[in-house]
């Protein structure tokens, strides 16, 4: 039995997968900030987690996915206000009793030190210093991401 949050996440991910393939992104769009091979957009309004997920989708992006501790630290360095929380693309899957990223992968327990409970209707937020489990209905800011396409040097054979 999937929760409404899980259904929302799956529906949006599937609709994103169905969309026509777009040319790769070489530079970050206006208002987006580059962090390594990603473009990040920090909201300044607040929403519950599922609305935040939907908003990123309308911007042809997803809620932030964090690969490892190093990426978390670099992202947190962009947050200058200690008091602000941002949703990322990680929530608790009741059916699998585990933290699940919106791309379908599960959280490696070593990646993030989460403060708070792992339970139904829990979603993950980050601040400048920490990672928190919050009720998904809590209205806070959020971070969207777009992947930059790596520029590969083309090698042309001798003519």
């Amino acid at each position: 039995q999937k929760s409404s949050i899980e259904k929302c996440s799956v529906d949006i991910q599937q609709s994103r997968n169905k969309t026509t393939e777009r040319p790769g992104l070489l530079n970050c769009p206006i208002y987006w900030q580059q962090l390594r091979e990603k473009c990040l957009l920090f909201s300044h309004t607040v929403n519950p987690w599922n609305n935040s997920l939907a908003d990123c989708s309308t911007k042809e992006s997803s809620l932030l996915l964090i690969r490892d501790k190093d990426e978390l630290i670099h992202t947190q360095n962009l947050i200058r206000d200690k008091a602000i929380l941002f949703w990322i693309g990680l929530n608790f899957s009741l059916s699998e009793k585990n933290w699940k990223w919106i791309n379908g992968s599960f959280l490696n327990s070593n990646d993030l030190e989460i403060r708070g409970d792992a339970k139904e209707n829990s979603c993950i937020s980050i601040s400048q210093t920490s990672v928190y489990s919050e009720y998904c209905s809590t209205e806070i800011r959020w971070i969207c991401q777009k992947e930059l396409t790596p520029v590969r040097n083309k090698v042309y054979p001798d003519s």
């Epitope: 769009p29 300044h44 911007k59 206000d81």
Partner: antibody, heavy 118, light 108 residues
Framework: QVQLQESGPGLVKPSETLSLTCTVS????????WTWIRQPPGKGLEWIGY???????NYNPSLKSRVTMSVETSKNQFSLKLRSVTAADTAVYYC????????????WGQGTLVTVSS | EIVLTQSPGTLSLSPGERATLSCRAS???????LAWYQQKPGQAPRLLIY???SRATGIPDRFSGSGSGTDFTLTISRLEPEAFAVYYC?????????FGQGTKVEIK
Amino acid sequence: QVQLQESGPGLVKPSETLSLTCTVSGGSISSYYWTWIRQPPGKGLEWIGYIYYNGNTNYNPSLKSRVTMSVETSKNQFSLKLRSVTAADTAVYYCARDGGPWVPLDYWGQGTLVTVSS
Amino acid sequence: EIVLTQSPGTLSLSPGERATLSCRASQSVSSSYLAWYQQKPGQAPRLLIYGASSRATGIPDRFSGSGSGTDFTLTISRLEPEAFAVYYCQQYGSSPPTFGQGTKVEIK
């Protein structure tokens, strides 16, 4: 209610640096894109650039070589410096709050006329 | 950069009439990131419409926006005396954001 107020000299000599400050009241500067726009007398609007509260900037390519923006979150202020000014830089300079892809330029200062003349 | 061309340059109408202002972009405006502003003499511009069709806070419903891609329209259904002003369109979907040259709505 968010309010923005520009301040700075109204007269700048050619080849010197134009310096303006915008003070934000009624809201925190710790979010949004804080923007400068100018309007030469009797003409249209030109976007100069923005600074995000964490210091990230984006400038109009036509002015990029001469522009520097900075932000002081503790004072709720952001600033514009435009180097090597000429008479063509004479304009009303506005500061504004830009909500980016959500809601664009929703709050503006009343503008300040800067004249470049010797 | 995206060039926005507004037409007509001047629109002469009487109070109570309907005004239709056009804004055409030199290339497609990303995600309909197009806004309309009203400016009166000696004042800063005021945001009317964003996202091509969403009204800003406090803007009466006689102002409406439409369009997508390269063609956008601002419609004022009934011109009140205070609506006579200059109107600018702006795209904010690509850098640098750009403004149209403006349409002046004047009393006939």
